[in-house]
Interface confidence: low
């Protein structure tokens, strides 16, 4: 289920799957939510630790049991991923942090009159992930009203420093507030060039596009279909970027499909989940559990309810069925995508709906003159 | 909203505008999306207009002037007014609207979390009221959704300011001693939300007040936590399963 409570002065011991710098616990929680394996997180505010390297540290954690031992740590904040929390799942983060400088690659500097304008510039720049703004009262006059647009390899700051009269924040592209607009077109039999930022296996180009949209550095992608000539590259989704933000070249290529991230779409972003079920397909991965259920939809529901489950295969082989119930294989991987996609099998596969934000599975814990 | 500022897109994605279409169309009240098919608002919004067909509910909007004849809106399937609400009193000023069709959630249109039943222990320090209502007592409906940060006031303090009225435990008050910031006409039914542990919760429903933003006259809101049983009962009995963001 959905657990939203935060634990003050507590730190989860062990289970680390990733770490990064984030300005507060809420942003850390959001990164945990979108990480394929993160179930728990712990965050160390600047006030909680003397070690400069660990200040603003966000530690993403996994656990086979879904829980980890909590240790007392003054100032630390821990909590759960919001996977399975329905509408609360959002990559949108509007907060502006005063007195904080989020470090990264500064690729653009301009003078603006307010931090809101700086955030808007970041939101309207295809490569900008976060920004810092030096206010009117910044100690060095020449830097006052400077708006620094930034990016980093992981989409989070490479460091966060406490610095007076500096304000920082993130791009509002995940809030569907970009003025850039997006290319919805999918280009059949076309391969894009440029830098690969990640490689995953997907059953179709639409899943590839959604993964690209929510990857911090993916601007466009190329997908190799299941009939691509090189067997080892079938169903490969290559997430790509470039200096300019657009592909520098494209090559006509049979059985490839290319397209763009939808992060810059105005007003609507795709859900960060994949609801389609793929008949005759087997998704390979680490076995989490095997259960007998009646029908592929129940298998998907079972996967969705089991928080660590990322995808599933429902077998229809006679030896895997008892009366009207058949085996539902609940699986996971390091990156949330199948490690193998096989066709022509007696069964169907699909993904957990734990990151779908439309579900009703979300929970929020915790007369004179009428107007 | 008196003393407020413009909101930005998606800042308050649960805020809806309740409008009436007769010969002309106008905004009458606010409301809060609490589920795919449910809006929570004030009962007094329906005092003179119980005709569900004349109401249009706009969600996912910021600027009322952007509404055209082509702007999609929701229609009402059912209006559920609290059984103890009386037109002549300010008590139990709460109503649920069941929409004819469920809404999809987006960054600009999604529900607000409800508080836990009888939530009295949480100390809310970051509370906001939003709406398109008047920006002064004898004002007019605003085009852009307004927001204002207002502190909660204890019921004891509130009762002192409203000697002629009974401020019950099922009400919550908010305002500045010096006035200047408040909800006003047209904000009725809209949300008083507070951020706690990074999460927004619907603490109150804009209900009434003496004028708007007057000194030592806080706004009075229906306390949502006190009506959680009622909300759950009505939303669950309607179709057998909770359709809003209920407390764990």
């Amino acid at each position: 289920g959905c657990l939203t409570q935060l634990y003050e002065n507590a730190f989860f011991r062990g289970g680390d799957v990733a770490s990064m710098y984030t300005p507060n616990a809420q942003y850390c929680q959001m990164r945990c939510t979108f990480h394929p394996r993160c179930l728990l997180f712990s965050f160390l505010p600047a006030s909680s630790i003397n070690d400069m390297e660990k200040r603003f540290g966000c530690f993403l954690k996994d656990s086979v049991t879904g829980t980890l031992p909590k240790v007392h740590r003054t100032g630390a904040v821990s909590g759960h991923s919001l996977k399975q929390c329905g509408h609360q799942i959002s990559a949108c983060h509007r907060d502006i942090y005063k007195g904080v400088d989020m470090r990264g690659v500064n690729f653009n500097v301009s003078k603006v009159s307010s931090v809101e304008e700086c955030q808007k510039r970041c939101t309207s720049n295809i490569r900008c992930q976060f920004f810092s703004y030096a206010t009117q009262t910044f100690h060095k006059a020449e830097y006052r009203n400077n708006c620094l647009l930034k990016y980093s390899p992981g989409g989070t700051p490479t460091a966060i420093k406490v610095l007076s009269n500096v304000e920082s924040g993130f791009s509002l592209k995940p809030c569907a507030l970009s003025e850039i607009g997006c290319h919805m077109n999918i280009f059949q039999h076309l391969a894009f060039s440029d830098v690969d930022v990640a490689r995953v296996l997907t059953p179709d180009a639409f899943v590839c596009r959604t993964i690209c949209t929510y990857h911090p550095n993916c601007l466009f992608f190329t997908f190799y279909t299941n009939v691509w000539k090189i067997e080892s590259q079938r169903n490969v989704c290559l997430l790509k970027t470039s200096e300019s933000g657009t592909p520098s070249s494209s090559t006509p290529q049979e059985n490839t499909i290319s397209g763009y991230s939808l992060l810059t779409c105005k007003r609507t972003l795709p859900e960060p989940c994949h609801s389609k079920i793929y008949p005759g397909v087997d998704f390979g991965g680490e076995e989490l559990n095997v259960t007998f259920v009646k029908g592929v939809n129940v298998c998907q529901e079972t996967c969705t309810k089991m928080i660590r489950c990322q995808f599933f295969t429902y077998s229809l082989l006679p030896e895997d069925c008892k009366e009207e119930k058949c085996k539902c294989f609940l699986r996971l991987s390091m990156d949330g995508s199948p490690t193998r996609i096989a066709y022509g099998t007696q069964g169907s596969s699909g993904y957990s709906l734990r990151l779908c934000n439309t579900g009703d599975n979300s929970v929020c814990t915790t007369k004179t003159s009428t107007r | 909203i008196v003393g407020g500022t413009n909101s930005s897109w998606g800042e308050w994605p649960w805020q809806v505008s309740l409008q009436v279409k007769l010969t002309a169309q106008r905004h009458l009240c606010g409301g809060s999306l609490i589920g795919h098919q449910w809006v929570l608002t004030a009962a007094h919004c329906f005092d003179g207009l119980p005709l569900q067909d004349v109401w249009r509910i706009y969600s996912g909007i910021l600027n009322l002037s952007d509404i055209t004849k082509d702007t999609p809106f929701s229609q009402i399937k059912e209006i559920i007014i609290h059984q103890n609400y009386k037109v002549s009193e300010g008590n139990h000023d709460i109503a649920l609207i069941k929409l004819q069709a469920p809404l999809n959630y987006t960054e600009f249109q999604k529900p607000i979390c409800l508080p836990s039943k009888g939530d009295t222990s949480t100390i809310y320090t970051n509370c906001w009221v939003t709406g398109w209502g008047f920006s002064k007592e004898k004002g007019e409906i605003q085009n852009i959704l307004q927001k204002v940060n207002i502190p909660l006031v204890t019921n004891e303090e509130c009762q002192k300011r409203y000697q002629d009225y009974k401020i019950t435990q099922r009400m919550v008050c908010a305002g500045y001693k010096e006035g200047g910031k408040d909800a006003c006409k047209g904000d009725s039914g809209g949300p008083l939300v507070c951020k706690h542990n990074g999460m927004w919760r619907l603490v109150g429903i804009t209900s009434w007040g003496e004028g708007c933003a007057r000194r030592e006259q806080p706004g009075v809101y229906t306390k949502v936590a006190e009506y959680m049983d009622w909300i759950l009962e009505k939303t669950q009995s309607s179709d057998g399963k909770a359709q809003m963001q209920s407390p764990a």
Epitope: - | G48, I81, S88
Partner: antibody
Amino acid sequence: EVQLLESGGGLVQPGGSLRLSCAASGFTFSHYIMMWVRQAPGKGLEWVSGIYSSGGITVYADSVKGRFTISRDNSKNTLYLQMNSLRAEDTAVYYCAYRRTGVPRWDAFDIWGQGTMVTVSS
Amino acid sequence: DIQMTQSPSTLSASVGDRVTITCRASQSISSWLAWYQQKPGKAPNLLIYKASTLESGVPSRFSGSGSGTEFTLTISSLQPDDFATYYCQQYNTYWTFGQGTKVEIK
């Protein structure tokens, strides 16, 4: 005691005008939606017009739209119906009515006046 | 506009009879239907609202049922005071009355 008292009826020629009043007492007039309903001699009931508690919103039956105007003066606890361009088919007893309950969604009318007769004839 | 059709127009009955009047709406009105009784020279009197809820002070021999488009008013045992004209009224969208049913002595 709750009471509605209509007045202003009478004989008028086709094309003429008449203003009906309904004096309310025994309840907080300003809190309620108010209605005019009419009944032609020997015929059934027909809803004519309604007005929002504050007076800000008015609704009319198609048969009177553009000719009749409903209004209210909450300070005087009075409801009005200004009838212009009267026709023979407007001849009827005119009742004012409202719903007393605290749940306005159930807006059948439980409180009615005794009616005032309007005759349109040359 | 929603039309309301009542039947029968006239009904002859005796004291003690069970009387049923029906009302049909031209489109679904959920349960937003009321029944009124009217005597000559008098204002109508509300009997039932929301299709089946008895108005306070109304004798229990009156009952209402139905939802959507079909509605019924039943008088379980007709009393001398019940000879009158009965109207149904929808209030789903504005207000429309049926043409009335006159209950007269057989």
